[in-house]
Amino acid sequence: PEPPTACREKQYLINSQCCSLCQPGQKLVSDCTEFTETECLPCGESEFLDTWNRETHCHQHKYCDPNLGLRVQQKGTSETDTICTCEEGWHCTSEACESCVLHRSCSPGFGVKQIATGVSDTICEPCPVGFFSNVSSAFEKCHPWTSCETKDLVVQQAGTNKTDVVCGPQDRLRA
């Protein structure tokens, strides 16, 4: 019979024949032959392979180094790598999450649009007219100006993006 030019899923072509790939969590020791099956071996502790493969070496688990602000989000297994995230108040510097930086604070005049997570930084937005923020914070949104009218008061000092309005008593009309 003609030697195959393509193989089924979870197989690979070697020496004109189709061999079974090793399952996730195992590495290749020897290719199959006419008479023997593919020989695979489990990955060692703290190693993994996450696909059907013909790798001769397993990959090492990622180390979530606490000195870099990292912590384990998901423990590694023979079939999956360790997933790292950042300690509270920090976020990853890249998608691979190899180190962490402190969450950014929004300056006065800006409020938090989106609170930071372990993988994304704080998103700030300028306080629009009618809102203010007088603190530097990683959590505070822009606050609406105080409504003097609802308190039967009048605006004595206009608000800005950094300060609230100042309310005062209405001037009594003289007789």
Epitope: P24, Y63, K75, G76
Partner: antibody
């Protein structure tokens, strides 16, 4: 037969130090991750620390971070726990336990060694 | 940290009766890569160290009698002893094997009525 034998426990004064050992036999020690887990008298289990088979990865519980150091000597089939700045709340039976690369669970435990921190 | 909550704290059951205990985790123990729940059960008999009973929620460790079974997923798990034997008197601990720090439940003590 897999055997894990802890030693080094005893009475220590608060602020003192102690080094625990765990002698492993009956398996290829260098192929396994290892843990220390403790159990205060009459209480439940508390994980303390982990070290990977090749010494590359080490994790600690927050309660012992900066005070305890886990290490291993694969040539001597031994696991260690160096305990410094000991506190009364560290009083417990300390177990070493093995973690394999398949289950990723603690599949064998030693008998434990008792550390008592008291003045 | 993941908090493991076991219930009940203790239970007394007649020999041959069915025993059910529960374990709840404060977050999912499902590994997104291999779709296994990393929930482990350990048995600790009086005066002895813990012994691995069940891993990956429902896989019995070699040598563990088939009267022991585990079930559940995500955050809710159950250990069942189908017919209690005298040698099953112990404290049973569930454990988060999903992430560090590894955390244990406070245990469920099983006694004979």
């Amino acid at each position: 037969e897999v055997q894990l034998v802890e030693s080094g426990g005893g009475l220590v004064k608060p602020g003192g130090s102690r080094r625990l050992s765990c002698a492993a036999s009956g398996f290829t020690f260098s192929d396994y991750g290892m843990h220390w887990v403790r159990q205060a008298p009459g209480k439940g289990l508390e994980w303390v620390a982990y070290i990977s088979s090749g010494n590359r990865i080490i994790y600690y519980a927050d309660t012992v971070k900066g005070r305890f150091t886990i290490s291993r000597d694969n040539a001597k089939n031994s696991l260690y726990l160096q305990m410094n700045s000991l506190r009364a709340e560290d009083t417990a039976l300390y177990y070493c336990a093995r973690q394999d690369g398949y289950r990723y669970a603690m599949d064998y435990w030693g008998q434990g060694t008792l550390v008592t921190v008291s003045s | 940290d993941i908090v493991m909550t076991q219930s009940p704290d203790s239970l007394a059951v007649s020999l041959g009766e069915k025993v059910t205990m529960n374990c709840k985790s404060s977050q999912s123990l499902l590994n997104s890569g291999n779709q296994k729940n990393y929930l482990t059960w350990h048995q600790q008999k009086p005066g002895q160290p813990p012994k691995l009973l069940i891993y990956w929620t429902s896989t019995r460790e070699s040598g563990v009698p088939d009267r022991f079974s585990g079930s559940g997923s995500g955050t809710d798990f159950t250990l069942t002893i189908s017919s209690l034997q005298a040698e099953d008197v112990a404290v049973y601990y569930c454990q988060n094997d999903y992430t560090y720090p590894l955390t244990f439940g406070a245990g469920t003590k099983v006694e004979i009525k």
